[in-house]
């Protein structure tokens, strides 16, 4: 799940079995000119960045779990 | 590589109490969860609870509530569990077990220690 | 508090047989449950988790399946040193419950 920082696609790959508990935020990248696929990247409660499937029903499910509550906050 | 390492057997008067610890080795110790669990002589597993040491955050169940008490020293990367009020229901086998950050799985675990309340 | 049920209790089998343990949980927990595998005298083992993703060093020989309620866990061509306790673990919704626990034998 590590995750690069230049100007291409940031995923070289994901993390399976993600749990929302220790997620803290999450950065949903949509495709650009530097990264053809959407890109979801995760900071967990220690800091650490996490790729996550963006194909994933879970990932799905905290992706929308996350924008409820900012919207709610 | 990541080791827990449970401090040894206590044998304890019913009405007193004790503190156990766990030192942890081979990681960011702050960054993880910890977790306790209690297995009673022939019985199954029991989650007690948890703390985020970089924090101190404590998540507990509420079975367990009043009864343990979970507290972390980064300084010396060691997680402890006083147990208070001991009866003989508290004589068990306790382990700590570290919680992985990103899938929350309990991938390491101690040896244990047996602690007995007997008069 | 999510309950767990697991079954058999115990169960003997031979080795290079198969055996399968089932845990119904007592609501959707999301395929996050793990298997841990119990020996005397030593800390649990995690095999599996999040329903079916093998714990490194773990081998191919188990295997788990499920999703919403039920789920089961599998190893197959038994050998000697599988004869262990195993639990279940629900960990979708805080306290994180366990099964009973299988406790496992050899014919």
């Known amino acids: 799940a590590s995750v690069a920082t230049e100007l291409r696609c940031q995923c070289l790959q994901t993390l399976q079995g993600i749990h929302p508990k220790n997620i803290q935020s999450v950065n949903v990248k949509s495709p650009g000119p530097h990264c053809a696929q959407t890109e979801v990247i995760a900071t967990l409660k220690n800091g650490r960045k996490a790729c996550l499937n963006p194909a994933s029903p879970i990932v799905k499910k905290i992706i929308e779990k996350m924008l409820n509550s900012d919207k709610s906050n | 590589q990541v080791q827990l390492q449970q401090s040894g057997a206590e044998l304890v008067r019913p009405g007193s109490s004790v503190k156990i610890s766990c030192k942890a080795s081979?990681?960011?110790?702050?960054?993880?969860?910890m977790n306790w669990v209690k297995q009673r002589p022939g019985q199954g597993l029991e989650w007690i609870g948890q703390?985020?040491?970089?924090?101190?955050?404590?998540n507990y169940n509420g079975k367990f509530k009043g009864k343990g008490t979970l507290t972390a020293d980064k300084s010396s990367s060691t997680a402890y569990m006083q147990l208070n009020s001991l009866t003989s229901e508290d004589s068990a086998v306790y382990f700590c077990?570290?919680?992985?950050?990103?899938?929350?799985?309990?991938?390491?675990w101690g040896q244990g220690t047996s602690v007995t309340v007997s008069s | 508090d999510i309950q767990m049920t697991q079954s058999p209790s115990s169960l003997s089998a031979s080795l290079g047989g198969k055996v399968t343990i089932t845990c119904k949980a007592s609501?959707?927990?999301?395929?996050?449950i793990a298997w841990f595998q119990h020996k005397p005298g030593k800390g649990p083992r995690l095999v599996i988790h999040?329903?079916?993703i093998l714990q490194p060093g773990i081998p191919s020989r188990f295997s788990g399946v499920g999703s919403g309620r039920d789920y089961s866990f599998s190893i197959r061509n038994l050998e000697p040193e599988d004869i262990a306790t195993y639990y279940c673990l629900q960990y979708d919704n805080l306290p994180w419950t366990f099964g009973g626990g299988t406790k496992l034998e050899i014919k």
């Open positions: 999040y329903t079916s």
């Open positions: 703390i985020y040491p970089g924090d101190g955050d404590t």
């Open positions: 077990a570290r919680e992985r950050d990103y899938d929350v799985a309990m991938d390491y």
């Open positions: 609501q959707d927990i999301n395929k996050y």
């Open positions: 081979g990681y960011a110790f702050s960054d993880y969860w």
